[in-house]
């Protein structure tokens, strides 16, 4: 039934209001049943089939072949002490499109999870002659032309809008029912916003001479990718290594993963200079900086800002 | 068209050099990291080296490492392989491929080019 | 050790199902993808990082990851998916690593 108190339609295509004590009704038919309008300055007007030739009514529906923009206002079921009350807004169809944008449903669909899309009217279903679905107003060559369907692992150029349009006949003529999804495909809400452990900035007592080991850590996903910078461009310096990653899994299916940069044989050229750690994701990049200064130096600086 | 399309491949001598360049078009070049990756005859793929989007940070396989140098232009949709100091086991097909993600180095390369053949030989 | 170790050669019936492995200690950590190679053409994913499979690519083949070895499957294999096969992932260095790829027959 037509449990919904407030409807927006199109104009233009075939819409029905269903009471919801349908079940009631057929129990007790000698029953007096009736549908009434009200808009504007009409009070309760009476529906019958003599009202609009595009009106028709049976025990537990009222029918509109088709709605028009003149249909707009409430209406009222009415059964011994049973009442129900819509409002229905019937809505200009838009000319220059498939679909009409106020009449989407949007639904958001993570990557790799499994995506459906079935073009299926139960109400009018035996009216139906073909069924055709549509991608942002293209349609799509798909086997079954009475019940269209998708089915799939979402991919990111799955994302559009997708139009169900049923066509069906009554009274010799042709209608049509469109139902349109608007599909946003969005990244594996499981994955996490990549972060960097630790100060942003770290200030490293060193030694000449001595070597160093700068520890970066990060909690990141799989794909995520964690890198020191250390401006290689100016002539690979031998005395720089990144060493291999190490990564343990976290309980919760996420990973720790860790990045040394080692500097041996510290020369005046490695001190006071921005070495940065990276983690990549596709939220973007977060960094951190370490900065190697002479211990001898250290006074200069506030001591909560050195990192062992 | 999204494409790659590869050159400056040739036959060489063993302790010359080659530039090769790969031709990107119908994506946005600037937003990806870029592979090179080879195919000696009969044999298997073999990863060369990556470059991150902005140029930035490149990385080598350890049996280029010192002799071939990864560059790219973004202004050009172009990128480079500089490969100096060739040596016979660098014949290959040469193929620039570009990463499936917004994260540079991915292993997941979903564009390749058709591949330009080196010959390194005395 | 970053190498993959995959079968050299695989054989299959027209319409069975066939499964590729690939192992190596990278794989406990990091993605691996899959590519497809006919002779004399370039490499094509078949299967991207997040066992994702990208655009034109048909659902008989899945990829699947457990412990240090991954997988693709093949599921109602056809003639034109003869061919070979060879899996990749990053490794700790921050480099990608290709397994040495599987012959794939199908009979």
């Known amino acids: 039934c037509t449990s919904r108190p407030h409807i927006t339609v199109v104009e233009g295509e075939p819409f029905y209001l269903k009471h919801c004590s349908c079940s009631l009704a057929h129990e007790i038919e000698t029953t007096t049943k009736s549908w009434y309008k009200s808009s504007g300055s009409q009070e309760h007007v009476e529906l019958n089939p003599r009202s609009s030739s595009r009106i028709a009514l049976h025990d537990c529906v009222l029918e509109f072949w088709p709605v028009e923009l003149n249909d707009t206002g409430s209406y009222f079921f009415q059964m011994k002490n049973y009442t129900q009350k819509w409002k229905l807004n019937v809505i200009r169809r838009n000319k220059h499109s498939c679909f009409t944008e106020r009449q989407v449903t949007s639904k958001i669909v993570e990557v790799k999870k499994f995506f459906q899309i079935t073009c299926e009217n139960s109400y009018y279903q035996t009216l139906v002659n073909s069924t055709s679905l549509y991608k942002n107003c293209k349609k799509l060559l798909l086997e079954n032309n009475k019940n269209p369907t998708i089915k799939k692992n979402a991919e990111f150029e799955d994302q559009g809008y997708y139009s169900c349009v049923h066509f069906l006949h009554h009274n010799g003529k042709l209608f049509n029912i469109t139902k349109t999804f608007n599909i946003t495909i969005v990244e594996d809400r499981s994955n996490i916003v990549p972060v960097l452990l630790g100060p942003k900035l770290n200030h490293v007592a060193v030694e000449l001479g001595k070597n160093v080991r700068l520890n970066c850590s990060a909690l990141l996903n799989e794909e995520d990718v964690i890198y020191w910078m250390f401006g290689e461009e100016n002539g690979s310096d031998p005395n720089i290594h990144e060493e291999k990653e190490m990564r343990i899994m976290t309980p919760e299916g996420k990973w720790h993963a860790s990045k040394v940069l080692r500097i041996e044989n510290i020369g005046e050229s490695n001190l006071n200079v921005l070495y940065n750690c990276t983690v990549a994701s596709t939220g973007g990049t977060d960094t951190k900086s370490f900065i190697l200064v002479r211990k001898a130096d250290m006074a200069d600086i506030p001591g909560h800002v050195f990192t062992r | 068209e999204v494409q790659l399309v590869e050159s400056g491949g040739g036959v060489v001598q063993p302790g010359r050099s080659l530039r090769l360049s790969c031709a990107a078009s119908g994506f946005t070049f600037s937003g990806y990291g870029m592979h090179w990756v080879r195919q000696a005859p009969g044999k298997g793929l073999e990863w060369v080296a990556v470059?991150?989007?902005?140029?930035?940070?490149?990385y080598y396989s350890d049996s280029v490492k010192g002799r071939f140098t990864i560059s790219r232009d973004n202004s050009k949709n172009t990128l480079y392989l500089q490969m100096n100091s060739l040596r016979a086991e660098d014949t290959a097909v040469y193929y620039c491929a570009k990463g499936s993600s917004s994260i540079w180095l991915t292993s997941a390369l979903n564009l390749w080019g058709q591949g330009t053949t080196v010959t390194v030989s005395s | 050790s970053s190498e993959l170790t995959q079968d050299p050669a695989v054989s299959v019936a027209l319409g069975q199902t066939v499964r590729i492995t690939c192992q190596g200690d990278s794989l406990r950590s990091y993605y691996a993808s899959w590519y497809q190679q006919k002779p004399g053409q370039a490499p094509v994913l078949v299967i991207s990082?997040?066992?994702n499979r990208p655009s034109g690519i048909p659902d008989r083949f899945s990829g699947s990851s457990s412990g240090n070895t991954a997988s693709l499957t093949i599921t109602g294999a056809q003639a034109e998916d003869e061919a070979d096969y060879y899996c990749?992932?990053?490794?700790?260095?921050?480099?990608?690593?290709f397994g040495g790829g599987t012959k794939l027959t199908v009979l």
């Open positions: 990749a992932s990053r490794n700790g260095w921050n480099h990608v690593v």
């Open positions: 990082a997040k066992n």
């Open positions: 470059i991150s989007n902005d140029g930035s940070k490149k």
